[in-house]
Structure formats: structure tokens, C-alpha cells
């Protein structure tokens, strides 16, 4: 576990002049930033959007845009952008920084947001290292920033996967946690306020109860976007009382241009129609040249370069910008209790014993509907079924012609003839038997069992060859 930290130093026109904003501001503005982290893109599967996490900065100071030229450097929000990560730090990652402008005019539906710049870079970074500085151009804009990844105790190391242990031989006792990296002792974790939610609360100082995003209340038991009166269970309900419903995050639909709003913990998400983009679907000037299709999506433009775009998304992604991972297993494509695995590039079904097929649709134990061709019969057993084929046929479904002479069954130069009931051997002079296996003595008496009555040596010997082909 740990935190990725991003510090924006400046954002303004790059060398070579002031960029002309594609959006005309009608009043005071302020900036904010969004950071998105993805693991280094693997060769096997496309990663889900911002799989390592994302964060929004606070809003920066209000400024008024001059139509002639923007300020040399636009005023920035205070503080770091922090993206906590729960698992190991991957080392190689994609860093996406978006600069957004919020117009504070008198628009209906609240402020208008527009995306000014977006930089995407793949980076290699070890956790615990110093701040790494960078300067990136996005069109005519220039963004200067620093970033680092740091582990949160007890995790240490370049990937935050090692746990710090005391150097002394004795391990930490009950109720104690491992030491800080350079200390040779154990420390007790802070005791949170009594009743603080184990699920939604945490503390860094004894006696406090800090809430995870989306939860509130003294003990972090109240969801932020509660839309109806909630009586809390437990001893605190009498003191907490009933939460008065505030406006839900989707009230009044903050999504512009026909976007649909869905609530998320403590916030909302807009699903934008074709041709629109942004946190509130407010950006309409985006074309394919802006690269709006994420996760390998292909941008298909309209008849002219300035017309609206659509994104053709790779399998496994959806949304107007291919920004949402499809939970294809939720459609329960695997039949007969099979386990669904979404590999990113394809679906796989792991079938229960006795079932097979891409979607576990074949019941191996079931002869019902199982067609064995050419007179074959279906035989169940051993957790599978098979076809027992009639003479002259083989293969999984008895559809293949089987040549009984292919194995050269007639000994001593006998000639083999296929027959509806099997095969017939025409023996060379001096031999007899169903497969010409017995030599004939000079006096015409066989040394082994005699030929069937009425059959002279050298006559064709008919041998009913019951050679069933069993295929699992």
C-alpha cells in the first residue's frame, strides 16, 4: 500500500506564444486537474481505465481570462494530488494528467467545464525514490510537474511489497505493528474512537475517526448520498438521529448535452452521447484529432474533420469514449454452472465435470440428442459419452469411413477385401484361416484347428471383424 503524489508547478503557454483557447470563456474561471494512473500496459490484456486510481485536485484561484492572451501562467490549486494504491506499486505505469477549466458564469445547470490539455506518458518509477520532475507539452500549452510514489507503513521497498520488521529477534507482540523502516522497535497502532466503522473509517491519531470517501458521520456509518431518511442501528442512533436528505448528486441532471447521470459514492458519473466528452459531457469541440477514444478505441469521424466522432471500442470496453470496462461475465454466458473468466481480450468458460464446449453447452454424459451416424450407438459411462460405431465406420460421430483392410490383417501375402460385415482374406496357396494365419501341411491336414467344413484351403476366408471405434 502507498500513495502516488503529483505536484503541479505551472501551467501556461509553452515557448512560441499563447495558445488560442478553443472555447470562449464568458466570465471568471478557475483551473483544476485530474490525474489517472494505469499499470504499464501488458502484452496480454488491455488494462481497465485508471486501474491504479485517479484523483481530482481542488479548484484553483479564480481568474478572469483576457480575450487577447491568457496569463503567462494560470493560477494553480493548492496542495498535492494524491492517489492511494492498495496493492504493490507496479514500477512501470501510464500517467495521464488532464487540465480542466471551470467557467463560473451564470450558465444554466451550474459551471461549464472544458478540457484544456491532456498529457499521457508512460513512466518508470520506484516507490520511495525522490521527486521526479517533468515538463510536457500539450498542443501549445506547457505543464510542469513533479511526482513520486511513497509506501505507507508497514510497507517498504521499491514496490511497497516488503513489510518492515523489527531488527531485534523478538517479533511484535499482540496489538503492536511492525516498526518504521529505520527503528528497532514495535509501535502500537492508534486506537480509533470507540464505534468507528471498521469498514468505512480509519484513524491516524488515537481517538479520531476519519471517513473514507462516500461516508460521513462521527463514526463513518452514514453514506454521503443518502436520499432518504436513515435510522442508524446501534447505540449511536439516538444521538445521530435521522439524516435529512440533501439533494442527490444527480438532481437536476448535471450532465449536459443529453448525457445521462448515475450516482457513485459521494459523486456522480455522466454517460455522454456521441460527440461529447468531459466530466459533465460539456466538451463538444472534440474531434478525432483530440484522441478521445481510450483503451485502444478507434475514432471514427463524421463526413468532415470538425464533425462529431464515435469510438469503436475493442471487445471488453464500452462507453462513448471506451472508458468503461464491460463486465461480460455479468451476462452469465457460461451454461451448466461453468465459471466465467474475462481475460480482457476474450471470454473463457471453465466447465464443470461432465460439460464441454466454448460456453459449457455440451453435456458429455447425455446421449439425448447425441447423433451417432451410420448406425452407431451412443454409450454413456465414465463421465463421458462415446459412439460405438458400426463396422466400416469410425471417428467421434461415426462419420468417417473406416477401411478394415488398412491394417493389412491378412497374413502370409493374403489379399484383403472389404465386406459389409467386416473383411475377407483371400489366402495365398499353402495358407488358410480367417486371416491366413495357419500354414497347410502337404497332406492337406492343418497343424492347428481345421478350416470350417466345406471350405478348401486357398478359398477366401470370411472373418466378421467387429472392430468398434471407441472415441471419447
Amino acid at each position: 500500500a502507498g500513495v502516488f503524489e503529483l505536484q503541479i508547478h505551472s501551467f501556461g503557454p509553452g515557448p512560441g506564444g499563447a495558445p488560442r483557447s478553443p472555447y470562449s470563456a464568458r466570465g471568471p474561471c478557475r483551473l483544476f486537474f485530474r490525474v489517472c494512473l494505469k499499470p504499464g500496459l501488458s502484452e496480454e490484456a488491455a488494462e481497465s481505465p485508471c486501474a491504479l486510481g485517479a484523483a481530482l485536485s481542488a479548484r484553483g484561484p479564480v481568474y478572469t481570462e483576457q480575450p487577447e492572451a491568457p496569463a503567462p501562467d494560470l493560477p494553480l490549486p493548492n496542495g498535492l494530488l494524491q492517489v492511494p494504491f492498495r496493492d504493490a506499486w507496479p514500477g512501470t505505469f501510464s500517467l495521464i494528467i488532464e487540465t480542466w477549466r471551470e467557467e463560473l458564469g451564470d450558465q444554466i445547470g451550474g459551471p461549464a467545464w472544458s478540457l484544456l490539455a491532456r498529457v499521457t506518458r508512460r513512466r518508470r518509477l520506484a516507490a520511495g525514490g525522490p521527486w521526479a520532475g517533468d515538463i510536457q507539452r500539450a498542443g501549445a500549452w506547457e505543464l510542469r510537474f513533479s511526482y513520486r510514489a511513497r509506501c505507507e507503513l508497514p510497507a517498504v521497498g521499491t514496490a511497497c511489497t516488503r513489510l518492515c520488521r523489527p531488527r531485534s529477534a523478538s517479533r511484535c507482540g499482540p496489538g503492536l505493528r511492525p516498526c518504521a523502516p529505520l527503528e528497532d522497535e514495535c509501535e502500537a497502532p492508534p486506537v480509533c474512537r470507540a464505534g468507528c466503522s471498521l469498514e468505512h473509517g480509519f484513524c491516524e491519531q488515537p481517538g479520531e475517526c476519519r471517513c473514507l470517501e462516500g461516508w460521513t458521520g462521527p463514526l463513518c456509518m452514514v453514506p454521503v448520498s443518502t436520499s432518504s431518511c436513515l435510522g442508524l442501528r446501534g447505540p449511536s442512533s439516538t444521538t445521530t438521529g435521522c439524516l435529512v436528505p440533501g439533494p442527490g448528486p444527480c438532481d437536476g441532471n448535471p450532465c449536459a448535452n443529453g448525457g445521462s447521470c448515475s450516482e457513485t459514492p459521494g459523486s456522480f458519473e455522466c454517460t455522454c452521447p456521441r460527440g461529447f466528452y468531459g466530466l459533465r459531457c460539456e466538451v463538444s469541440g472534440v474531434t478525432c484529432a483530440d484522441g478521445p477514444c481510450f483503451n485502444g478505441g478507434l475514432c471514427v469521424g463524421g463526413a468532415d474533420p470538425d464533425s462529431a466522432y464515435i469510438c469503436h471500442c475493442p471487445p471488453g470496453f464500452q462507453g462513448s469514449n471506451c472508458e468503461k470496462r464491460v463486465d461480460r461475465c455479468s451476462l452469465q454466458p457460461c451454461r451448466n454452472g461453468g465459471l466465467c473468466l474475462d481475460l480482457g481480450h476474450a471470454l473463457r468458460c471453465r466447465c464443470r465435470a461432465g460439460f464441454a464446449g466454448p460456453r459449457c453447452e455440451h453435456d458429455l454424459n447425455d446421449c439425448a440428442g447425441r447423433a451417432c451416424a451410420n448406425g452407431g450407438t451412443c454409450v454413456e459411462g465414465g463421465g463421458a459419452h462415446r459412439c460405438s460405431c458400426a463396422l466400416g465406420f469410425g471417428g467421434r460421430d461415426c462419420r468417417e469411413r473406416a477401411d478394415p483392410c488398412a491394417a493389412r490383417p491378412c497374413a502370409h501375402g493374403g489379399r484383403c477385401y472389404a465386406h459389409f460385415s467386416g473383411l475377407v482374406c483371400a489366402c495365398a496357396p499353402g495358407y488358410m484361416g480367417a486371416r491366413c494365419e495357419f500354414p497347410v501341411h502337404p497332406d492337406g491336414v492343418s497343424a492347428l484347428p481345421a478350416a470350417p467344413p466345406g471350405l478348401r484351403p486357398g478359398d477366401p476366408q470370411r472373418y466378421p471383424h467387429h472392430h468398434h471405434h471407441h472415441h471419447h
Epitope: D290, P292, C293, G296, L298, C299, V300, H312, P315, L347
Partner: antibody
């Protein structure tokens, strides 16, 4: 590993319609986009069209008025039809699978040469 | 459409040498959606690089890709005999999908 096999006539008369079929060796036809690309003798590659089992298609604008791409999941096949062919359409035609991480092509058929002549 | 121009047209090198191939786009290739292919005579192309810098499965690490925006590079750090072939770049950020004209790497 999945394999792709193109099939169709190697000789087409001018003004007629070229029809090619690509057979996918496994049952993955519903998991990927599938595409046709061509290469005139001694020249470079030209993308023609792609299709997804959901019905999504996309065509190269330079050929769109003459091209139809279709897909048959039951046969694990997809097909290309190019109408009103001329000598300029003579090429090696490849079918290919679209990569799962973007619209590049990770599996290709061996290609089939199509000659246009009367 | 985005036009991709590859240079040089032909590159004459010896085995063991380093090859640097260039692909320049007429406009920005969004999200570094650029691929490289290798094609031997009489064979279909083979995907080498996608996303400008990610090697496809089974591709040796002597092949590497770099670049963003409009300028992209394929580097073969040490040429092996089987590397002498034609190389194509392809952008897949904006429809229509387009290929470069190719660079032939031949034995000097």
C-alpha cells in the same frame, strides 16, 4: 494458436464482383473484430474494412461504395465482396484478426492472389 | 486521413548492425496508437510493436519502438539474418486505418 484461411476465385473478370471468404480455425469469431487488407504486387498495404459480431462495421472511404463485409458466426467465417472490379483491384488479399488492444492486426491469413483479367 | 511516410525507403546494413526506421504522420497519432509490422517475401505481415512501444507476444527484445505525436521510430538493436525484410508502420487512432509505404532493410 488460431489460424485464418482465405478462399475464393483467383481470377475475376473486370466489372464483376470479387467474393472472398476467411475461415477462422477456432470458435473465437465472437471475441474479436475481423478485417480485410490488400497488397497490390510490389506495393504497400491497404486496409479495406473490418466487422464485429455485434454488427459494427467500418470501411475505407476510398472503397466504401464497392465493398461489403459480412460475418457468419455459425460457420466461423467472414466474407468480403468487392463489386465492379478493375485491374487496379488486383492484389494479394489478406484476412486478419484485429488485436484486442487496439485496431492493429495480430493474426493474418497467408493471403490469396486475385487477378483481374478478361 | 492520416498519411504515414516511412524513411528511408531502403536501408542497406550488415548483420549485427543497428537499424533505425522512421515513420512520420501527417497529423498527430492519438494516444500513440501506432503499430509496426515485418513482412518477408511471399509471407503475410507479422505484428511487432503496438502502442508505439509495446512488443507483441513472442517478439525478440532487439526490436523496440518509440515516439509520440507525429514522429515514431522502430529500432532493431542488432540485425539478425532473419530481420532483413520490409517493415510497415500503421496508425489505429483515427479511421481510416492507414499504413506507411514501407522500409526495406536489405543486406549490404
Amino acid at each position: 494458436q488460431v489460424q485464418l484461411q482465405e478462399s475464393g476465385p483467383g481470377l475475376v473478370k473486370p466489372s464483376e464482383t470479387l467474393s472472398l471468404t476467411c475461415t477462422v480455425s477456432d470458435n473465437s469469431i465472437s471475441n474479436y473484430y475481423w478485417s480485410w487488407i490488400r497488397q497490390p504486387p510490389g506495393k504497400g498495404l491497404e486496409w479495406i474494412a473490418y466487422i464485429y459480431y455485434s454488427g459494427t462495421t467500418n470501411y475505407n472511404p476510398s472503397l466504401k461504395s464497392r465493398v461489403t463485409i459480412s460475418l457468419d458466426t455459425s460457420k466461423n467465417q467472414f466474407s468480403l465482396q468487392l463489386s465492379s472490379v478493375t485491374a487496379a483491384d488486383a492484389a494479394v488479399y489478406y484476412c486478419a484478426r484485429v488485436f484486442h488492444w487496439g485496431f492493429a492486426f495480430d493474426i493474418w491469413g497467408q493471403g490469396t492472389m486475385v487477378t483481374v483479367s478478361s | 486521413e492520416i498519411v504515414l511516410t516511412q524513411s528511408p525507403g531502403t536501408l542497406s546494413l550488415s548483420p549485427g548492425e543497428r537499424a533505425t526506421l522512421s515513420c512520420r504522420a501527417s497529423q498527430r497519432v492519438s494516444n500513440t496508437y501506432l503499430a509496426w509490422y515485418q513482412q518477408n517475401p511471399g509471407q503475410a505481415p507479422r505484428l511487432l510493436i503496438y502502442g508505439a512501444s509495446s512488443r507483441a507476444t513472442g517478439i525478440p527484445d532487439r526490436f523496440s519502438g518509440s515516439g509520440s505525436g507525429t514522429d515514431f521510430t522502430l529500432t532493431i538493436s542488432r540485425l539478425e539474418p532473419e530481420d532483413f525484410a520490409v517493415y510497415y508502420c500503421q496508425q489505429y487512432g483515427t479511421s481510416p486505418l492507414t499504413f506507411g509505404g514501407g522500409t526495406k532493410v536489405e543486406i549490404k
